[in-house]
Interface confidence: low
Amino acid sequence: SEVEYRAEVGQNAYLPCFYTPAAPGNLVPVCWGKGACPVFECGNVVLRTDERDVNYWTSRYWLNGDFRKGDVSLTIENVTLADSGIYCCRIQIPGIMNDEKFNLKLVIKPAKVTPAPTRQRDFTAAFPRMLTTRGHGPAETQTLGSLPDINLTQISTLANELRDSRLANDLRDSGATIRIG
């Protein structure tokens, strides 16, 4: 079943998706599509990365996280009711039928008040639990996310770091996080 995320009309919606590169620089192609994940690829692609870059994106869809570290979470800017629905995050691991597929359900609620224009990016939705680690640099143990180089011993302070990453402060036990390699 899909994990559900919520946003109000006029806000930015945040749909989390993560993977852990096998080694620094070993990025895996990822696609985001509107609609549940099909057997192959993504339907109605809204954003795509390759082994080194975001190589396709459409208006209002972007990656605010640090995709170079495997944070391929999707932000949808200034959502409307029409943005409701299932979104597919597909991590295209090399090999036959190796892809990791995550269906995330976005529920858009009518705005309580008309939002004032602002440069601040207010993300709504929960941050997924971050359990995967990878090696980087001299004997560092990492967790993955838009924050660099957070040690597992620092998980207890993660809520403070999440504030800095502009994501919601509440941790959830669900979300799209996988380890590659």
Epitope: G25, D53, V54, W62, L63, F67, A139, L147, D149, E161
Partner: antibody, heavy 122, light 107 residues
């Protein structure tokens, strides 16, 4: 030789905005190897403050919360230039601003720009 | 935010002496610390990455050590060209932060 050449000094009035630029040369701005451009502030006689980064290939940005309203980072891949606009300037914004390069997966600044001095005065 | 405290604010040494700069982090950051030199009216220059890793083109008299919260930059035989400000910087978590710097003076 990798270089980050910054625009010249700026004298601006309080309340105004200013845009400073950082032109990269000696490496591929948006090539196979991913490089981020960071911006750092240094007030006279003081230390260094990180403002934020931009990845020129996608325009993705990340800001220090303290500078989220003050600074806007953009990049023009056709000219291999990263820009930073500072708005609603006050005397507190008088500083030298540096751009710096960070290679993918390294998380340190291996090349620094020449610096741009911004003076806010009426 | 992670606070980096450098001490002392000013170091005064004679040429040829060994000198050490201290950088203390407000929480454990593994080895995610980097050292920069900034000469008067110049841009910062990377000296040491990840607490102890050397940088190509930097004289071998510069070295670094430490992990967790306490880090040290050392110059084993100071030369006059080393007169500068020295900064540590952490890349353990956003926002990146710098120490307040230590000024090296030659007696």
């Amino acid at each position: 030789q990798v270089q980050l050449q910054q625009s010249g000094p700026e004298l601006v009035k309080p309340g105004a905005s200013v845009k400073i630029s950082c032109k990269a040369s000696g490496y591929s701005f948006t090539g196979y190897y991913i490089h981020y451009i960071h911006w750092v502030k240094q007030r006279p006689g003081q230390g260094l403050e990180w403002i934020g980064w931009i990845y020129p290939g996608s325009g993705n940005t990340k800001y220090n919360e303290k500078f989220k309203v003050k600074a806007t980072l953009t990049a023009d891949t056709s000219s291999s230039t990263a820009d930073m606009q500072l708005s609603s300037l006050t005397s507190e914004d008088s500083a030298v601003y540096y751009c710096a390069r960070e290679a993918w997966g390294n998380w340190y600044f291996d090349v620094w720009g020449t610096g741009t001095t911004v003076t806010v005065s009426s | 935010d992670i606070l980096l405290t450098q001490s002392p604010a000013i170091l005064s040494v004679s040429p040829g002496e060994r000198v050490s700069f201290s950088c203390r982090a407000s929480q454990s950051i593994g080895t995610s610390i980097h050292w920069f030199q900034q000469r008067t009216n110049g841009s910062p220059r990377l000296l040491i990455k990840y607490a102890s890793e050397s940088i190509s083109g930097i004289p071998s008299r510069f070295s670094g050590s430490g992990s967790g919260t306490d880090f040290t930059l050392s110059i084993n035989s100071v030369e006059s060209e080393d007169i500068a400000d020295y900064y540590c910087q952490q890349s353990n978590s956003w926002p990146y932060t710098f120490g307040g710097g230590t000024k090296l003076e030659i007696k």
